[in-house]
């Protein structure tokens, strides 16, 4: 009886694992083995595929074969008993194109209201992704173990921190990798769960903002308690993509070590042009807070997007706000040659209920105010281009009292 060729050969490549699966064409014939040959592009001869010779099952692994993953190859398979079947040729393929990204490795660390996630590729020193190691981005799904309501976080790098969690709560997450340059989305890691710690006595500093004054950067933050000392650290933002890099070390800003106020001032020349991350920590001498949320600090943007200056004309029932260009040292106005929008926040001095107005124009009327009432106003500029999406810090608040009734002219 003639042996039939095997059919329906599938090539599965996950990271550096090359697996072949196929169907027997004749289940009734026992003791059949299967063998594969491969052929590289531009070659006439077929070579025996090591790891896939005289296989009794319908699966084999040819990961040990050192292939150029960007080069097209062709496979063929035949069945063998006393005689052999004809060869069945598999459509040629390029390993890199066919490859899937495997599940990444995930390591979690818990804080009281945050989880630090360390992500690394599932296959160390992968040949398949050797040229793309730094191009991986990751996405994750996280949920409270008790509720199961999922939140998705896209486009993160190999070190990521999720904030605003609840203390003493178990969270579960799974992570997958993507190579957006090659339109490849990987498979999810196993689910990892971790319980956040008991709430820390000292909360982390909040609302960190950087502004420019003269030739200095001014870093400000909010803190709940008085009589604290603070330290500020920085890191090159690109290192988030590559935490294996030996340079991945947070560094102190010399003028911001053990400061007693909720701000510190340091010269602009501390940082060369670039994008940095900044974080702040509080201490009372005995206890230390966790680090604040990291803020991104772009020296280029910081230098060019300054808070607007404005003045207020007060009437009985309204404010007229006139927004001008920000001033540099020497009181010269800064020329900002890209379209801006202005966010104007105001509130009644006796209340903390803020209102927000967004305008492109530089003269804004805030109507329907109460006479003889103190209102406070602050403003900041945003680039109109949503892709650039940059913002200045807020100007200092200016407070004014509305006039008595009937002065609306």
């Amino acid at each position: 009886k003639n042996l039939k060729s095997p059919q329906k050969v599938e090539v599965d490549i996950i990271d550096d694992n090359f697996i072949l699966r196929w169907n027997r064409s004749d289940e009734s014939v026992g003791n059949v083995t299967f063998s594969f040959d491969y052929q590289k592009t531009g070659m006439d001869n077929w070579i025996k595929l090591s790891g896939c010779q005289n296989i009794t099952s319908t699966k084999c692994n040819f990961s040990s074969l050192k292939l150029n993953v960007y080069e097209e190859i062709k496979l063929r398979i035949r069945a063998e008993k006393e005689n052999t079947s004809s060869w069945y040729e598999v459509d040629s393929f390029t390993p890199f194109r066919k490859a899937q990204i495997g599940p990444p490795e995930v390591h979690l660390e818990a804080e009281d209201k945050a989880i630090v996630i360390h992500i690394s590729p599932g296959t160390k020193d992968s040949v398949m992704w050797a040229l793309d190691g730094l191009s991986f981005t990751y996405s994750l799904v996280i949920w409270k173990n008790s509720s199961g309501v999922e939140e998705r976080i896209e486009n993160i790098y190999s070190r990521h921190k999720i904030y605003k969690l609840s203390p003493e709560t178990t969270y579960c997450l799974k992570v997958k990798a993507a190579l957006l340059t090659s339109w490849k989305i990987g498979v999810y890691s196993p689910v990892h769960c971790i319980k956040t710690t008991v709430e820390n006595e000292l909360p982390p500093p909040e609302n960190i903002e950087v502004s420019v004054q003269n030739q200095n950067y001014v870093l400000k933050w909010d803190y709940t308690y008085a009589n604290m000392t603070f330290q500020v650290q920085w890191l090159h933002a690109f290192l988030k993509r590559n935490p294996g890099n030996h340079l991945y070390k947070w560094k102190q800003i010399p003028d911001c070590e053990n400061v007693k106020t909720t701000q510190c001032v340091f010269p602009q020349n501390v940082f060369q042009k670039g994008i940095y991350l900044l974080r702040v920590q509080a201490s009372d001498g005995n206890n230390t807070s966790f680090w604040s949320e990291e803020i991104k600090f772009d020296t280029e943007i910081q230098a060019f997007l300054l808070p607007p200056v404005f003045n207020i004309r007060s009437l009985s029932d309204s404010f007229h706000i006139y927004i001008g260009a920000p001033k540099q040292s020497g009181n010269t106005p800064v020329i900002q040659d890209y379209p801006l929008i202005y966010e104007i926040i105001f509130w009644e001095n006796t209340s903390n209920a803020e209102r927000k107005i967004i305008e492109k124009k530089t003269d804004v009327t805030v109507p329907n105010l109460k006479p003889l009432t103190v209102y406070c106003v602050k403003a900041r500029a945003h680039t109109m281009d949503e892709k650039l999406n940059k913002s200045s810090v807020f100007s200092d608040a200016v407070c004014e009292k509305t006039k008595p009734g009937n002065t609306s002219k």
Partner: nanobody, 128 residues
């Protein structure tokens, strides 16, 4: 603060209609111009702008996927914005959110997304 209350969501057969309402209640004072709009979101996807209207100019914006089927309108006296949805399709199934920005000069889906106050949402389900 600004509070938004959506209503009018529900289940409907493909080809049917629904009218969503969003009432904007602002304590302390009212700004003369608002930009109000509707977004929708399905699980795991980003919120997408559906329609927006400027109370100052009456100018409107529509996403390509709803043009000719959805109409946004306003009742300034009631500080309410409506979304009339006709010829509904299964792919219109989503949570619909109302958003408002206090602005007379900047009324786009981007403005609402970046700076808007948001409502809690109302579910719209269209079955085939």
């Amino acid at each position: 603060q600004v509070q938004l209350q959506e209503s009018g969501g529900g289940s409907v057969q493909a080809g049917g209609s629904l009218r969503l309402s969003c009432a904007c209640e602002a304590s302390r004072y009212t700004y003369s111009s608002n930009c109000m709009g509707w977004f929708r979101q399905t699980p795991g996807k980003e919120r997408e702008g559906v329609a927006a209207i400027s109370t100052a100019s009456g100018s409107t914006y529509y996403a390509d996927s709803v043009k000719g089927r959805f109409t946004i309108s306003q009742d300034n006296a009631k500080n309410t914005v409506y979304l009339q949805m006709n010829s509904l399709k299964p792919e219109d199934t989503a949570m619909y959110y109302c958003a408002v920005v206090e602005s007379s000069t900047y009324c786009t889906p981007d403005a609402l997304k970046r700076f808007g106050y948001w409502g809690q949402g109302t579910q719209v389900t269209v079955s085939s």
